[in-house]
Interface confidence: medium
């Protein structure tokens, strides 16, 4: 299963499969997740070790048993790969590191005014993997405001040094934020020239392209099909790069297929897994296990659940079958790809889905309406559960926010539907940041069912909660993921670090905002809240948030949106933006529906016919 806990002051002994320099434990964990054999990692921050060579060391580890002995090491951080962790799997890393210089090959230098602009330049440069920026207070005047774009053979820094007034970070291309755009075309009977960065075996060009997309130095590829004239080169996928970023030449060649990495695609990247099953094909590799199962799909599921399994072959040979079950060979290799691919067999083969991020796994997202006043712009993928509920009558307009809690479920406020109970007038937009990006061609979800709490009454503040069942399930992406729900009876007073988001008014008599706004707001006790709203009853099923002095709040248009808080290392949906006296007024906190109080109701309503809860819960 998915293991998310980190071990502080602990280092895993042995099992090393790779090592590199990373700026923090989270980036180290991401590299472990995408490494074909890494199950565990240990990271040494600068403060944990005097040995300069080992500072910022990230050690990727494998273990036949899935665990390794932990030794005490002050400052070290260890943990697990996020393989099998569904929507938590992402190669996107947004953090900027202050006082740190990430070294690599400096191939471009320019003057910019901010570190954000430097990161944007890196994201928009095809070869840039990471960058360093010298601030205006850097000790050497001639280097101030320099933005250095960098790459390295492995995609990670060749060294990391502590250096004052320098800020570093990574390209946001894996966040699907590149402005470059990508070539989706696959070119039949064409071979690309230039430098080979890696060679793997794949069953088709599409798997080759996905591997290229997630390889740090692959910009384009050539695949040799299973009927290529040279037998030893059949099914070979050559991952390639060039100085210019594009192939310097291409040659017409029968039975070859070429194409480009999709890392520079905007808004959508392929999943880092391969779900197709290949009938009549055997994948060779190191044997992990052999088990009898009923059908190739069960074989794939078995491989996915066994964390070390990378690919499988399901044999239909009579000697490999008994009754309705046949042998499922679970296999692995050094690079995650088969060591041999054979055609015309009585087997079917495929890959583990452990890196797929659409899985309905049970582990919570670990990131981080009436209206948002005093907030700041959000960035792409920062609040991937936030949705915009829009109404299309003669014109189309944003009315409310909502929170994605499962593939087919959105949680919002009941009052959003006051006077608009018809489901066919609603359009739900997910995975968006700017309302102005919505055009007639932008995909949206339609409503299958609106479930308003049975005790909600129009123009009353109580039970302001509603569920929306979407007509079709949504896939999870970098920008579209669910938020976890709390446990029943969670005490809101013990939450800290809470945020409200939405496109609502930025002042009381304002207008809907274009860019999704965010604001950090402290929770207020119900007793304190009741004092501020003496004409209303603040019930235990509500939670309040706001600053005594006002100035930051939700506002009109934020209703139904999320109030999320970090709780014991995980993010949870604590409240639904409901009501308040004006916006951001002094001593007038915002009032939110307390989600923990409605957990029974949510689970009852989201139960599918097979009794499985269809929302994102942490259990």
């Amino acid at each position: 299963g998915c293991l998310t806990q980190l071990y502080e002051n602990a280092f895993f002994r042995g099992g090393d499969v790779a090592s590199m320099y990373t700026p923090n434990a989270q980036y180290c964990q991401m590299r472990c997740t995408f490494h074909p054999r890494c199950l565990l990692f240990s990271f040494l921050p600068a403060s944990s070790i005097n040995d300069m060579e080992k500072r910022f060391g990230c050690f990727l580890k494998d273990s036949v048993t899935g665990t390794l002995p932990k030794v005490h090491r002050t400052g070290a951080v260890s943990g697990h790969s996020l393989k099998q962790c569904g929507h938590q799997i992402s190669a996107c890393h947004r953090d900027i590191y202050k006082g740190v210089d990430m070294r690599g090959v400096n191939f471009n230098v320019s003057k910019v005014s901010s570190v954000e602009e430097c990161q944007k330049r890196c994201t928009s440069n095809i070869r840039c993997q990471f960058f360093s920026y010298a601030t205006q207070t850097f000790h050497k005047a001639e280097y101030r405001n320099n933005c250095l774009l960098k790459y390295s053979p492995g995609g990670t820094p060749t060294a990391i040094k502590v250096l004052s007034n320098v800020e570093s970070g990574f390209s946001l291309k894996p966040c699907a934020l590149s402005e470059i755009g990508c070539h989706m075309n696959i070119f039949q009977h064409l071979a690309f020239s230039d430098v080979d960065v890696a060679r793997v075996l794949t069953p088709d060009a599409f798997v080759c392209r996905t591997i290229c997309t997630y390889h740090p130095n692959c910009l384009f590829f050539t695949f040799y099909t299973n009927v290529w004239k040279i037998e030893s080169q059949r099914n070979v996928c050559l991952l390639k790069t060039s100085e210019s970023g594009t192939p310097s030449s291409s040659t017409p060649q029968e039975n070859t297929i070429s194409g480009y990495s999709l890392l520079t695609c905007k808004r959508t990247l392929p999943e880092p897994c391969h779900s197709k099953i290949y009938p009549g094909v055997d994948f060779g590799g190191e044997e992990l296990n052999v088990t009898f199962v009923k059908g190739v799909n069960v074989c794939q599921e078995t491989c996915t659940k066994m964390i070390r399994c990378q690919f499988f072959t399901y044999s239909l040979l009579p000697e490999d079958c008994k009754e309705e079950k046949c042998k499922c060979f679970l296999r692995l290799s050094m690079d995650g790809s088969p060591t041999r691919i054979a055609y015309g067999t009585q087997g079917s083969s495929g890959y583990s889905l452990r890196l797929c991020n659409t899985g309905d796994n049970s582990v919570c997202t670990t990131k981080t309406s009436t209206r948002i006043v005093g907030g700041t712009n959000s960035s792409w993928g920062e609040w991937p559960w936030q949705v915009s509920l829009q109404v299309k009558l003669t014109a189309q307009r944003h009315l409310c926010g909502g929170s994605l809690i499962g593939h087919q479920w959105v949680l919002t406020a009941a009052h959003c539907f006051d006077g608009l109970p018809l489901q066919d007038v609603w359009r739900i937009y997910s995975g968006i940041l700017n309302l102005s990006d919505i055009t007639k061609d932008t995909p949206f979800s339609q409503i299958k069912e609106i479930i308003i709490h049975q005790n909600y009454k129009v123009s009353e503040g109580n039970h302001d909660i509603a569920l929306i069942k979407l007509q079709a399930p949504l896939n999870y992406t970098e920008f579209q993921k669910p938020i976890c729900l709390p446990s029943k009876g969670d005490t809101s007073t013990i939450y800290t670090n809470c945020w409200v988001t939405g496109w609502g008014f930025s002042k009381e008599k304002g207008e809907i905002q274009n860019i999704l706004q965010k604001v950090n707001i402290p929770l207020v006790t119900n007793e304190e809240c009741q004092k501020r709203y003496q004409d209303y009853k603040i019930t235990q099923r509500m939670v309040c948030a706001g600053y005594k002095e006002g100035g930051k709040d939700a506002c009109k248009g934020d209703s139904g949106g999320p109030l999320v808080c970090k709780h014991n290392g995980m993010w949870r949906l604590v409240g639904i933006t409901s009501w308040g006296e004006g916006c951001a007024r002094r001593e007038q906190p915002g009032v939110y529906t307390k989600v923990a109080e409605y957990m029974d109701w949510i689970l009852e309503k989201t139960q599918s016919s097979d009794g499985k809860a269809q929302m994102q819960s942490p259990a």
Partner: antibody, heavy 117, light 107 residues
Framework: QVQLQQSGAELMRPGASVKVSCKAL????????MHWVKQTPVLGLEWIGA????????AYNQKFKGKAIFTADKSSRTAYMYLSSLTSEDSAVYYC??????????WGQGTLVTVSA | DIQMTQSPSSVSASVGDRVTITCKAS??????LAWYQQKPGKAPKLLIS???GLEAGVPSRFSGSGSGTDFTLTISSLQPEDFATYYC?????????FGQGTKVEIK
């Protein structure tokens, strides 16, 4: 690694009060709740409640309201549980425990409180 | 409050035996269940949770299953270090509550 160090055993008279301490090491004290659990041979493990050192917020099991009070000192990274009006029914081992998510992943070694005339 | 009922209260077994402990909740707890092991004079140790499954460092001979109100802890092949008391705990609804414990002793 995460460690929770509890104060030593206490022998108390009925009607007295006791303060049990729990020092947190190896993680950011203000980011995680500290929970308290009581263990007796008869009733087994019982959840008393929790404090969030970052916000000062508390949650109590109704059964222990008025009996237990939680506090936390950020500077010393220590959580305290104050038990008042002690009776023989309060004789137990008391544990502080820190969750990851919700389950209790880390435990102190326990503090034995004995109430006897 | 949700009541957690464990059975049996004790079990005698030998090294290599398969041991099964059950835990029944008085209402649906939506898989929010944890299992702990406790040895005499020591604090409980988290073995399995609904959130992350088997805890790091816990041998794979321990496994948890069940849903709704009925849950099971299985030790596939009992080892000498497994003789201890096992508790289940629900964290679906406050107050969090524990089962009364199952003592696994040497036959």
């Amino acid at each position: 690694q995460v460690q929770l160090q509890q104060s030593g055993a206490e022998l108390m008279r009925p009607g007295a009060s006791v303060k049990v301490s729990c020092k947190a090491l190896g993680y950011t004290f203000t980011d995680y709740e500290m929970h308290w659990v009581k263990q007796t041979p008869v009733l087994g493990l019982e959840w008393i409640g929790a404090i969030h050192p970052g916000s000062g917020g508390t949650a109590y099991n109704q059964k222990f309201k008025g009996k237990a009070i939680f506090t936390a000192d950020k500077s010393s990274r220590t959580a305290y549980m104050y038990l008042s009006s002690l009776t023989s029914e309060d004789s137990a081992v008391y544990y502080c425990t820190r969750p990851y998510g919700y389950p209790f992943a880390y435990w102190g070694q326990g503090t034995l409180v004995t109430v006897s005339a | 409050d949700i009541q957690m009922t464990q059975s049996p209260s004790s079990v005698s077994a030998s090294v290599g035996d398969r041991v099964t402990i059950t835990c029944k909740a008085s209402e649906d707890i939506y898989n929010r269940l944890a299992w702990y092991q406790q040895k005499p004079g020591k604090a409980p140790k988290l073995l399995i949770s609904g959130e992350t499954g088997l805890e790091a460092g816990v041998p794979s001979r321990f496994s948890g299953s069940g849903s709704g109100t009925d849950f099971t802890l299985t030790i596939s092949s009992l080892q000498p270090e497994d003789f201890a008391t096992y508790y289940c705990q629900q964290y679906w609804s406050t107050p969090w509550t524990f089962g009364q414990g199952t003592k696994v002793e040497i036959k």
